[in-house]
Amino acid sequence: DAHKSEVAHRFKDLGEENFKALVLIAFAQYLQQCPFEDHVKLVNEVTEFAKTCVADESAENCDKSLHTLFGDKLCTVATLRETYGEMADCCAKQEPERNECFLQHKDDNPNLPRLVRPEVDVMCTAFHDNEETFLKKYLYEIARRHPYFYAPELLFFAKRYKAAFTECCQAADKAACLLPKLDELRDEGKASSAKQRLKCASLQKFGERAFKAWAVARLSQRFPKAEFAEVSKLVTDLTKVHTECCHGDLLECADDRADLAKYICENQDSISSKLKECCEKPLLEKSHCIAEVENDEMPADLPSLAADFVESKDVCKNYAEAKDVFLGMFLYEYARRHPDYSVVLLLRLAKTYETTLEKCCAAADPHECYAKVFDEFKPLVEEPQNLIKQNCELFEQLGEYKFQNALLVRYTKKVPQVSTPTLVEVSRNLGKVGSKCCKHPEAKRMPCAEDYLSVVLNQLCVLHEKTPVSDRVTKCCTESLVNRRPCFSALEVDETYVPKEFNAETFTFHADICTLSEKERQIKKQTALVELVKHKPKATKEQLKAVMDDFAAFVEKCCKADDKETCFAEEGKKLVAASQAALGL
């Protein structure tokens, strides 16, 4: 499917609006510090060039690859070295090394100001004054803060963002209409970004085979009536889509995602009975809907697996003939029977099966050797079941905030070298597993909880990779993708850690805490809790609870005082002294 001009091909396939949006996302994800106006200028230049290629595919430079065209354009930015330092060295390289270099410089935690939401009237005026610029600014701000955001999905978010303003800026109570919608988009956007970050990490750190295994398991759970060949085709296509998006090839990614949605909808009958509604929607909604579609009903008469994968005399022959196909079939058959298992558990089982076959198929009596392979699965299944049971009980007993605090203490003791903001962010997200998953019936808890935890722990891994401070984090993050959560769960208190020096400034609070939202106030308290554990890693739960209760009472008291600042200064000193005494600091 070779085209004379790749840029013309993608412009025609995607249309001008999507083309411009995707180029803006691509540029903002690469050059995260560039001002909005600079990016818009670059996008307009690329778009004008693309139009000349549509008019005449043989025109000068139209035959160049998208990486060459986009890379050349990014390298025209005048302040590249001042703003990005060594990233400017990428421009001395040739493709494909130049693009790889840009990819390596994507920053998961860019030093950008927090997005502050203006007043509703201000936003509505901006929306009405220049809708196009307003929506481009949204794409730009999200893309630069989330350099791995799934680009075609970001177009879907932008469409919803536009719809929210279109509806709510005409409403009687604009704020009541708009703010909940924006909150929902923000929360969904963060979740979407984190899920995609795991897909990219899977591909980039563990390779295509790891991603394909994940996709086989997940699609087999979702489409249990589909044949193995059908699932395999979907996995191949999905892998291509995500490889492209994670590699910065956003135009190809969006185009291929649209093709995949089209294929799925044209072949619903052999894929899933749950796709009908999705397939009636417009493209962006359709693709999103398919990605989130509920699991189809399992066929009623799936036989046990032992006959084909344990009892058959042909197990080693079938394995030797096509190892990955045979393991893929095992994973497919296991996953379609077990929507109640997490994808990572299914992958651990498949890995154990593979290891057993590797050993046993070289043994004198292979069948005798692998006959009890399913027994090896038992501890692997039990471990997450027990962990989820215990943690859901703890969550139900404590509620979300205190459950987060328990996890903050747990994880700070495991990896105290990690920065406090990262520990707070990650532990708060880990704690959200309770409200997200514990409400589900038991058969849905494990896939909800453990696959969500994989996403959150990947956040820890990518943030830690930027500035590595803990060998234990590096080890858990890099050894095995599917065993990350068990690896972190197994970590005990780090006995090698030298407690942090006590700094009174860390525990000095001011009246500004009183005007913060409940969430921001929680974060302040949780930051103090992490610092407390870093100073006194051997502190007991009871000691920490007593100090935190005193701290909460202190904040409440001073926020009610007439002279808040004086109260914070005087009572704060007393609290620090009392806490030091209570913890033996």
Partner: nanobody, 115 residues
Amino acid sequence: QVQLQESGGGLVQPGGSLRLSCAASGSIFTFYRMAWYRRAPGKERELVALITTDTSTNYADSVKGRFTISRDYAKNTVYLQMDSLKPEDTAAYYCNVRNVERDYWGQGTQVTVSS
């Protein structure tokens, strides 16, 4: 080793109700398919109802609208609520559960519908 404990059978008048239960123990693997079969005197064994992990259900035409199968995932237990019972429902009812390793059958519990 998996054990199945069936209970709830008995003698009931036509139009009456019974609730069968079957508790499976001894398997760490969850059963992805749990079912009830029955065998009436002098007849072949037939599937009455089945339920899968995702709570999808299938019923024999003869019991649709009268029998309801359900399961307690955590307790590895399957139930069969039998309402509007008819004399032709008289049979030995067998619990059948399936995991990735194999199928397991219960000993059976007798249901007699008679006035």
